[in-house]
Structure formats: C-alpha cells, structure tokens
C-alpha cells in the first residue's frame, strides 16, 4: 500500500485534500519526498475508482494511517521497503 518514489519531476500536486479516505477505497499511496524540483513532500492516493487525490501531508488522518502502516511493516520486515521509480 505504501510506495516511496524518488523522481526528478517538479511538484505533481496542485490541490491537496485533508479529508479522510477509508482504506477500502484506496488502491495505493505514493509518497514523493521533497527535493528534486519540488520543495515539499507530496502524498498521492490512488483510489480503486481510478481517480487520484493529493493529500496534505499535514492532514491528521494520513499521518495516523502512515504510522499504523509503518508499525505493521516494521513488525514483518527488518527494514522498510522503498520502491524507486527511474526518472
């Protein structure tokens, strides 16, 4: 569910939402760390209905959800898995 991409593209998110999205509607979450042309961290939620939502990284719900996912992955894997996308 969690993917971290390092790209050389500029910022992808024009508008960000802070509204809670239930997990059953989410296909995957893409995290774009700041840098490489974008001054801010970006979180992109790919939904099962094929639409995409940029989520405010400061939104409480996404921080809580990522913390749960981090705990879950760290209990099953020795280190977090980061998927790199070739620019």
């Amino acid at each position: 569910v969690l993917e971290v991409y390092y790209t050389s593209l500029r910022c992808r998110c024009v508008q960000e939402s802070s509204v809670f999205i239930p997990r059953r509607f989410i296909d995957r979450i893409q995290i774009l760390p700041r840098g490489n042309g974008c001054p801010r961290k970006e979180i992109i939620v790919w939904k099962k209905n094929k639409s995409i939502v940029c989520v405010d990284p400061q939104a409480e719900w996404i921080q809580r959800m990522m913390e749960v996912l981090r705990k879950r992955s760290s209990s099953t894997l020795p280190v977090p898995v980061f998927k790199r996308k070739i620019p």
Epitope: S18, V19, F20, I21, P22, R23, R24, F25, K47, K48, N49, S51, E60, W61, R64, M65
Partner: antibody, heavy 120, light 107 residues
Framework: EVQLVESGGGLVQPGGSLRLSCAAS????????MSWVRQAPGKGLEWVAE????????NYAPSLKDRFTISRDNAKNSLYLQMNSLRAEDTAVYYC?????????????WGQGTTVTVSS | DIQMTQSPSSLSASVGDRVTITCKVS??????VAWYQQKPGKAPKLLIY???YRYTGVPSRFSGSGSGTDFTFTISSLQPEDIATYYC?????????FGGGTKLEIK
C-alpha cells in the same frame, strides 16, 4: 437533482421473502458504491450492506449476511436487496444510500425509504 | 464490530443555546466519522464528514471535531428547525456502524 426511490416494501409473513429495489436518477449510478440502511420503528439506524460499482466487492452486516443479498444492475440504474427467511425483527424502514467515494467517502444521498413489515 | 456510544440519548435545550453531543468509539477510527440529522418521517441528512468537514449547504452553526475514539458534534446556536435526532457513524471500516442517536427537543 439526485433521486433515490425505494420500492418493494410491504407486509410479509415470518419466513417469507421480499425483494427491495432502489431506482437512481440524476447521478452516474455506475460510478458509485451503494448501501442499504434500515431503521426499526422508534429505533436507530442500522447499516445492512454495501456494493461497489462493479459488484466485485460486497460487504454485509455480519448478523444479516446469511439471509440478505445486495445486488445491482447498472444498465437499469437500480440497486436491489433480496431478503429471505424474514423475521419480526426485520420490520423496518429500508433506505438506499449513495456511498460517495470521491469527496465525503460516506453516505451523502438517501432515498425516502420503503417500509417492510414482518408479521403473521 | 466497532461500537459507537452516543450521549446523551435525549436533550432539551432553548433556542440560542449551544448544544454538544459526544460519540465514543470502541476502537481507533482515525477521523472516519460522520454526523447525520434525521427529522421524523424523513431520511437522514449528512451534516459532517471526516469528523470536522461540513457537507455542502450545511449552516456554519453545525460543527464537528475529534479523532481516534472521541468525537464531538456541536450546534453553536440552536434554531427551531434543528429539532431532530442526530446520529454519529463510523465509516473507517465495515461493518459501518451508527451511534444510538440523540433526540433533540426545544425547552
């Protein structure tokens, strides 16, 4: 204007069956999850079931999944609830509701309900 | 199932009063809580989603807050047309569950 119109309610004997329908208009029905929610006389709201646009994901209230079946026909803009082995405690107003998965992620439009009475 | 404990079950208040309803959840539901208003003989209407977001067309006197297991719904200045039963609902996970409702009456 979004409209959800339920039908198919009525009086049925214990052990009997009933099929409820919900006709949708004013929305692109085939894009949305849909739910059934019921309300017994003088009681609160109870979620019954939900179905995704492709009918590939269906979730039920655990206490009802053995007797109730939710389905849909996108070509007819219609949602259905097949209710079998009905009991007195199934007596309620049954509402269909749109499950919005674009903005609110919850039930944002509701029909006016159809009444089901289970009695001998 | 996730249990929603709503309180009070009934409430009498005067026009202009500030009214607060609480919902305690049996497990963490993040901010996946909605609040509905239901008038007698009518279908429920969505007022608040994602714990604190007002739905389209909902007056600003209605507000919500909370996360995790504790949620609050507030009417800042009660109006005669607010007489109804109010329900909290979690949509964090299925089965979706509702609170028992709070019946609001005018003093």
């Amino acid at each position: 204007e979004v409209q959800l119109v339920e039908s198919g309610g009525g009086l049925v004997q214990p052990g009997g069956s009933l099929r409820l329908s919900c006709a949708a208009s004013g929305i692109d029905f085939s894009r949305y999850w849909m739910s059934w929610v019921r309300q017994a006389p003088g009681k609160g709201l109870e979620w019954v079931a939900e179905i995704n646009p492709e009918s590939s994901t269906i979730n039920y209230a655990p206490s009802l999944k053995d007797r109730f079946t939710i389905s849909r026909d996108n070509a007819k803009n219609s949602l259905y609830l097949q209710m079998n082995s009905l009991r007195a405690e199934d007596t309620a107003v049954y509402y269909c509701a749109r499950q919005d998965d674009y903005l609110t992620y919850t039930m944002d439009y509701w029909g006016q309900g159809t009444t089901v009475t289970v009695s001998s | 199932d996730i249990q929603m404990t709503q309180s009070p079950s009934s409430l009498s208040a005067s026009v202009g009063d500030r009214v607060t309803i609480t919902c305690k959840v049996s497990q963490d539901v993040n901010t996946g809580v909605a609040w509905y208003q239901q008038k007698p003989g009518k279908a429920p209407k969505l007022l608040i989603y994602s714990a604190s977001y007002r739905y389209t067309g909902v007056p600003s006197r209605f507000s919500g807050s909370g996360s995790g297991t504790d949620f609050t719904f507030t009417i800042s200045s009660l109006q005669p047309e607010d007489i109804a039963t109010y329900y909290c609902q979690q949509y964090y996970s299925t089965p979706l569950t509702f609170g028992g409702g709070t019946k609001l009456e005018i003093k």
